[in-house]
Amino acid sequence: KESCDVQLYIKRQSYHSIFAGDPFKLECPVKYCAHRPQVTWCKLNGTTCVKLEGRHTSWKQEKNLSFFILHFEPVLPSDNGSYRCSANFLSAIIESHSTTLYVTDVKSASERPSKDEMASRPWLLYS
């Protein structure tokens, strides 16, 4: 029998390389059975995850999964960092793994670096 617990399918140690000025959608894949849980996004500040209030979010439904989306319109240099989604389910909080956004300012980069370079060259990134 398949579990009816809520599950948040953000991959462990995942990251996204994005560019300031571009639009971006950060997706939190959510599996649930009967009732869709309340889901929120937060941004890590040290060991504390600060809830993101007043941001544009939406839901997308696919066959076996729903996605709670955080919209960046557009991406700002200050959006660099790690994010986590969490679901409120039966009075319990289920937290996802964090996913990291590496934001490059295209004005300071002569060419867009490769996806792997983004993760391995922190001096390109905003802290």
Epitope: K11, Q13, S14, Y15, H97
Partner: antibody, heavy 120, light 112 residues
């Protein structure tokens, strides 16, 4: 049942490029990470790198980073490894492996491996 | 890079004896999520590695309970309580906490 199968030329000339493919059946590669690992004859295991096929993002072993490229094709449900400027030291069995999700986050399914010999 | 050092390099035991393989990492393997991604693999000749233990001590499904794992931080141990003929293999520890991922050099288990 997850099944991984590596394929590619068994013989590569020195200074050439080693190209291997990992075909996946039984799951969508976008749901997980695909890793490449190699094992020289009679020696231990060396992690080469991994790819997130959902977005193409990679992480590589710094000792190989300048020569290695891992890519994926979601439509074919497969991942690929390219290693350039090969020498005899790159002779090894090359494995692709799947990283499963919660709660393991480890290499749970491996291909049988393909032997690549670098020789003229 | 995280260096994983296994000891001993090889081990020859009689059937029924207890096998202990140690693995020491050069940095703590405790991840930011509070978990320790230390795994043990078994590799038999001509075969790919097979996962035995994940998260330090959790036994993979189908693995006999004579296998166990323990440890924390930087020091870890794989124990086979009573060695059987089918346990002849090379055993590797592997860390999945830091990049690059790294394996121990392997410990070869033989029967006397």
């Amino acid at each position: 049942q997850v099944q991984l199968q590596e394929s590619g030329p068994g013989l590569v000339k020195p200074s050439g490029t080693l190209s291997l493919t990992c075909a996946d059946s039984g799951f969508s590669i976008s749901d997980t990470y695909i890793h490449w690992v190699r094992q020289p004859p009679g020696k231990g295991l060396e992690w080469i790198g991994r790819i997130d096929p959902a977005n193409g993002f990679t992480r590589y072993n710094p000792s190989l980073k300048s020569r290695v490229t891992i890519s994926s094709d979601k439509s074919k449900n497969q991942a690929s490894l390219k290693l350039s400027s090969v020498t005899a030291a790159d002779t090894a069995v090359y494995y692709c492996a799947r990283e499963d999700g919660y709660p393991y986050y480890t290499l749970d399914s491996w291909g049988q491996g393909t032997t690549v010999t670098v020789s003229s | 890079d995280i260096v994983m050092t296994q000891s001993p390099d090889s081990l020859a035991l009689s059937l029924g004896e207890r096998a202990t393989i140690n693995c020491k990492s050069s940095q703590s393997l405790l991840d930011v999520d509070g978990k320790t991604y230390l795994n043990w693999f078994q590799q038999k000749p001509g075969q790919p590695p097979k996962r035995l233990i994940y998260l330090v001590s959790k036994l993979d499904s189908g693995v006999p309970d004579r296998f166990s794992g323990s440890g924390s931080g930087t020091d870890f141990t794989l124990t086979i309580s009573s060695v059987q003929a089918e346990d002849v293999a090379v055993y590797y520890c592997w860390q999945g906490t830091h990049f690059p991922r790294t394996f121990g050099q392997g410990t070869k288990l033989e029967i006397k």
